[in-house]
């Protein structure tokens, strides 16, 4: 028994003096606690206890479930224990069937022995089946078998404590281990929409999946920048042990333009934290915007192809579109998508594809769409060039030379005189009169200018040449001249 | 033997106090969640929540989140719920129960329960 | 919060009857179910927990299985002693949420 110098407090003595005792099932057990200041006795096993306030605890007819430790304090609170063991053939074993484990930590079987002389005190699978193999235990008589590190594969792991007792195993009761999962990683976070557009008063309601290995994972909805609590709606599934979902639905049933702003979906455990955000933009009325992606004043050569290209944003759907010309609708050779197939996407494509294109179809092509809330359109001008083409050249009743040439850009009209028979013209003649006429055609179409000489001037045999060029190319039309005496006379002009 | 036994019937007015009590016997005190169970005349069973007299951690479901507050006091193994200032509405049973072995409160489930108190709360 | 959706709200039954109450959890809970029954004027018992295991001392006519989000209790062979209210409760995450109960009443 503890000894202590005199006057300080000692703790009580207990009789007998030892720190174990084994007593038969059925037998007395008698338990003396000596102390001036005695308070109570205490009985504990499995978390369960007793209390006695007499300091003599008797038990005459000693059971299993008697098993356990019995300490005695004092008024100083000083105590002194013994720990009794009832020995009883039929039940070696007292147990309480509730194991849980958490992951990593050191869990209790708690399957106490009721006779410290059997041997062999371990656990073993049920059914026969062996036990993992990096599985380590350490057994304790007073307490149970306890489970070192336990690891996620353990979970749902039946088992017994076993003793041997006359060279036969003997099995308790079985445990069935649960195990919590540790958390070894931040949770995983995901938002149904990055962004979301709404027009006021429409329902804006977004879902966050969280993925953990247990549902114990915090999560919930915030504004930035906001302390307001939003509404929000849970649904969670196991997919087998440690694979948990939860969804964390967020609505605003009626959105309004003031409730545009970035919303953080944010899930915590004990390893860390993670988040994702979405946006949302409420406006008070759709929109459309339109950006031509080529310019929208456009020159193309005759016979070429072009094609007429847009972008625009059109919140909500775009319902119509169309590409007109010259009042009429385009029903083909043009096409209509989404910039992306993403489901929040509000940018789309149209192209008008215009084939070898005429000079008679320049002028001004329209893109025009809507939908529900607004219409749009923007115009294209399209110039077609044209190399010129000489539409007359005459010798008019009063002597003049007349050319006359069409086409696109607006052409040029030089005058050339080549004596004799010279295949080169080169020496240029100035016009008398050069006019830009108005085309009956439509806008956009060719132009058209007369250009006259003096034939007077000419006195010599030889050819004139007219010459009618612009950016796209050139058209020559010669007159042939013969003098017979004094008379001149206009051969018949050609190309 | 293992036992919560729960203070007696309280019969209060409307915006007063109270506090009721639980006391744990035959198993240790601190190793185990005590929660509170409302049972409100003829209805179901509402859990309001938790706590963990070894370190005082406490769990409420969100519909008593601020309207009650659990305690402990784990040298005289008692836990308690209390009102600051009652409703008409809080009259009902209240039930401690001990949360069996389990991980932070969670799975297991109460194996031992109090015999209840009632509350009622009239002008 | 999860919801627990007990069926059916009462039933009326013999004795010796098998009788099946059935809760239906609004999401995965795993096996972290229990059930209890409550005598009028009384707590409420323990009578399963982890959706299967018996607690000590409960006679083995009473019965629980499931897992997920759909859990039975069974009672084999009814007994007079039996004619109680019955909940589930699920302990997977707060808050620990209770079914609205099933009445067995004798027939």
């Known amino acids: 028994q503890p000894s202590v110098s005199p006057g300080e407090p000692s703790p009580p003595s207990i009789h007998p003096g030892k720190s174990d005792l084994i007593v038969r099932v059925g037998d007395e057990i008698r338990l003396l606690c000596t102390d001036p200041g005695f308070v109570k006795w205490t009985f504990e096993i499995l978390d369960e206890t007793n209390e006695n306030k007499q300091n003599e605890w008797i038990t005459e007819k000693a059971e299993a479930t008697n098993t356990g430790k019995y300490t005695c304090t004092n008024k100083h609170g000083l105590s002194n224990s013994i720990y009794v063991f009832v020995r009883d053939p039929a039940k070696l074993f007292l147990v309480d069937r509730s194991l849980y484990g958490k992951e990593d930590n050191d869990t209790l079987v708690r399957c106490p022995l009721t006779d410290p002389e059997v041997t062999n005190y371990s656990l073993k699978g049920c059914q026969g089946k062996p036990l993992p193999k990096d599985l380590r235990f350490i057994p304790d008589p007073k307490a149970g078998i306890m489970i070192k590190s336990v690891k996620r594969a353990y979970h749902r792991l039946c088992l017994h404590c076993s003793v041997d007792q006359e060279g036969k195993s003997v099995l308790s009761e079985k445990f069935i281990l649960k195990v919590r999962p540790a958390f070894k990683a931040v949770p995983v976070v995901s938002v149904s929409k990055a962004s979301y557009l709404l027009r006021e008063g429409e329902e804006f309601t977004v879902t966050c999946t969280i993925k953990d290995v247990s549902s114990s994972v915090y999560s919930t909805w915030k504004r930035e920048n906001s302390q307001t609590k939003l509404q929000e709606k849970y649904n969670g599934w196991h997919h087998g042990d440690f694979n948990y979902e939860r969804q964390a639905t967020l609505t605003i049933s009626s959105a309004r333009v003031n409730d545009s702003g970035v919303f953080m979906c944010y899930a915590n455990n004990t390893f860390g934290s993670a988040n994702v955000t979405t946006t949302l933009e409420v406006v008070d009325k759709g929109f459309i915007n339109i950006f031509p992606m080529i310019n929208t004043t456009v020159f193309v050569n005759d016979g070429e192809n072009v094609d007429l290209i847009v972008e625009y944003e059109a919140f909500p759907k775009p319902e119509h579109q169309q590409w007109i010309y010259m009042n009429r609708t385009f029903t083909d050779k043009w096409e209509d998508y989404p910039k992306s197939e993403n489901e929040s996407n509000i940018r789309y494509v149209s192209e008008l594809h215009l084939t070898r294109l005429k000079g008679t179809e320049g002028g001004t092509y329209t893109f025009l769409v809507s939908n529900s809330d607004v219409n749009a359109a923007i115009a294209f001008n399209v110039y077609v060039n044209t190399k010129p083409e000489i539409l007359t050249y005459d010798r008019l009743v009063n002597g003049m030379l007349q050319c006359v040439a069409a086409g696109f850009p607006e052409p040029t009209i030089d005058w050339y005189f080549c004596p004799g028979t010279e295949q080169r013209c080169s020496a240029s003649v100035l016009p008398v009169d050069v006019q830009t006429l108005n085309s009956s055609g439509p806008p956009f179409g060719k132009l058209v200018v007369q250009s006259s000489i003096d034939s007077s001037a000419f006195k010599h045999n030889g050819t004139v040449e007219c010459k009618a060029y612009n950016d796209v190319g050139k058209t020559s039309a010669y007159f042939n001249f013969a003098f017979k005496g004094n008379n001149k006379e206009q051969i018949h002009p050609h190309t | 033997q293992v036992q919560l036994v729960q203070s007696g019937a309280a019969v209060k007015k409307p915006g007063e106090s109270l506090k009721i009590s639980c006391k744990g016997s035959g198993y240790r005190f601190t190793s185990y969640w005590i929660g509170w169970v409302r049972q409100m005349p003829g209805k179901g069973l509402e859990w309001m929540g938790i706590?963990?007299?070894?370190?005082?951690?406490?769990k409420y479901s969100p519909s008593f989140q601020g309207q009650v507050t659990i305690s402990a006091g784990k040298s005289i193994s008692t836990a308690y719920l209390q009102w600051s200032s009652l409703k008409a509405s809080d009259t009902a049973m209240y039930y401690c129960?001990?949360?069996?072995?389990?991980?932070?409160?969670?799975?297991?489930?109460?194996?031992?329960w109090g015999q209840g108190t009632m509350v009622t709360v009239s002008s | 919060a999860i919801q627990l959706t007990q069926s059916p709200s009462s039933l009326s039954a013999s004795v010796g009857d098998r009788v099946t109450i059935t809760c239906r959890a609004s999401q995965g809970i795993s096996s972290a179910l229990a059930w209890y029954q409550q005598k009028p004027g009384k707590a409420p018992k323990l009578l399963i927990y982890d959706a299967s295991s018996l607690e000590s001392g409960v006679p083995s006519r009473f019965s629980g299985s499931g897992s997920g989000t759909d859990f039975t209790l069974t009672i084999s062979s009814l007994q007079p002693e039996d004619f109680a209210t019955y909940y589930c409760?699920?302990?997977?995450?707060?808050?620990?949420?209770f079914g609205g109960g099933t009445k067995v009443e004798i027939k």
């Open positions: 129960a001990r949360h069996g072995r389990g991980y932070d409160g969670y799975e297991g489930a109460f194996d031992i």
């Open positions: 706590i963990y007299p070894g370190d005082s951690d406490t």
């Open positions: 409760q699920q302990t997977n995450s707060y808050p620990l949420t």
